[in-house]
Amino acid sequence: QPSCRQEEFLVGDECCPMCNPGYHVKQVCSEHTGTVCAPCPPQTYTAHANGLSKCLPCGVCDPDMGLLTWQECSSWKDTVCRCIPGYFCENQDGSHCSTCLQHTTCPPGQRVEKRGTHDQDTVCADCLTGTFSLGGTQEECLPWTNCSAFQQEVRRGTNSTDTTCSSQ
């Protein structure tokens, strides 16, 4: 059995040239005729040179999975799905996303170091000593309040709470 070159496919004991992306095999090669190809019908595609008798069905972006259509399917490219705003891709296969997760909300004591994108979760970072954050979408930790000369410090600030001052 012959081993075919790259971008050829085996038919019986003959190697036939593959069809171009966006096409599928209509008629395999023969003595005088190369591979006869046909364009992929709507909602189907082939992304690479291929020996397929049928094009592949285009993917569908499922809103219940947090997905939206970012790029429509073409005859040579599958649908590209992206996560809806506020979500990021949990399962990425090349440029294809199958499931999305909601962006992490930073807990109290942390700030948003890097905002979440369609393919990356939010990155949180601890507040430095002397600052605090209530968490959520806060990008900066706030400095503790300095009690004035006429006030008394009742409770020292933590990374999640401000200093508590009381009037004398």
């Epitope: 190697c15 040239p17 171009n20 096409y23 090669c29 190369g34 591979t35």
Partner: antibody
Framework: EVQLLESGGGLVQPGGSLRLSCAAS????????IHWVRQAPGKGLEWVST????????NYADSVKGRFTISRDNSKNTLYLQMNSLRAEDTAVYYC???????????WGQGTLVTVSS | EIVLTQSPGTLSLSPGERATLSCRAS??????LSWYQQKPGQAPRLLIY???KLQSGIPDRFSGSGSGTDFTLTISRLEPEDFAVYYC??????????FGQGTKVEIK
């Protein structure tokens, strides 16, 4: 003698239309697929379109898709190319080609010149 | 689409010399390649099909070889009428049919 003879070329303005014909003689026209191939002045050969012998399968180059229409009348041994929305870059000699060695092109017409210019 | 690249662009030789023209495909076209000759003001003429089969009526000083991605047209001894432009064309996977950009064989 096996022969293909093109006609219908000429000067046309951008956006205009033209219909080319290719008359076949000396062979059983209805048995063969036929191609249109063009050649811009001083340039190489470019495949334009192909129609199968019964006329049921038609293919076009991306550069002409949606603007050109190939057809054939087997009773008249004639091939046609309807060219609409013509552009300056469509200026070329247009050849029809066919032959026994399909899809190799062993019979060619003498060509007809299409000039798209304002 | 499959791109065919011909080399050299121009070949300057004398009558009686051997001419070797190359055609390279961007991916395999098997054995499905033709060579055409075109003289100024004339339609192309089929010389070789199936990479190596000589078209009827073509002198046997013309020969073709190769398969896959690399093909060669050889003219064993150039005659004065052989000075012309030569094109390769693939039909390994179509549509589209594609042609090389041509090699001009000129008198040195």
């Amino acid at each position: 003698e096996v022969q293909l003879l093109e006609s219908g070329g000429g000067l046309v303005q951008p956006g205009g239309s033209l219909r080319l014909s290719c008359a076949a003689s000396g062979f059983t026209f209805s048995n063969y697929a036929i191609h249109w191939v063009r050649q811009a002045p001083g340039k190489g050969l470019e495949w334009v379109s192909t129609i199968s012998s019964p006329g049921s399968t038609i293919n076009y180059a991306d550069s002409v898709k949606g603007r050109f229409t190939i057809s054939r009348d087997n009773s008249k041994n004639t091939l046609y190319l309807q060219m609409n929305s013509l552009r300056a870059e469509d200026t070329a000699v247009y050849y029809c080609a066919s032959g026994y060695l399909y899809p190799a092109m062993d019979v060619w017409g003498q060509g007809t010149l299409v000039t798209v210019s304002s | 689409e499959i791109v065919l690249t011909q080399s050299p662009g121009t070949l300057s030789l004398s009558p009686g010399e051997r001419a070797t023209l190359s055609c390279r495909a961007s991916r395999s076209v098997g054995k499905y390649l033709s060579w055409y000759q075109q003289k100024p003001g004339q339609a192309p003429r089929l010389l070789i099909y199936g990479a190596s089969k000589l078209q009827s009526g073509i002198p046997d000083r013309f020969s073709g070889s190769g398969s896959g991605t690399d093909f060669t047209l050889t003219i064993s001894r150039l005659e004065p009428e052989d000075f012309a432009v030569y094109y390769c064309q693939q039909y390994g996977s179509w549509p589209p049919f594609t042609f090389g950009q041509g090699t001009k064989v000129e008198i040195k």
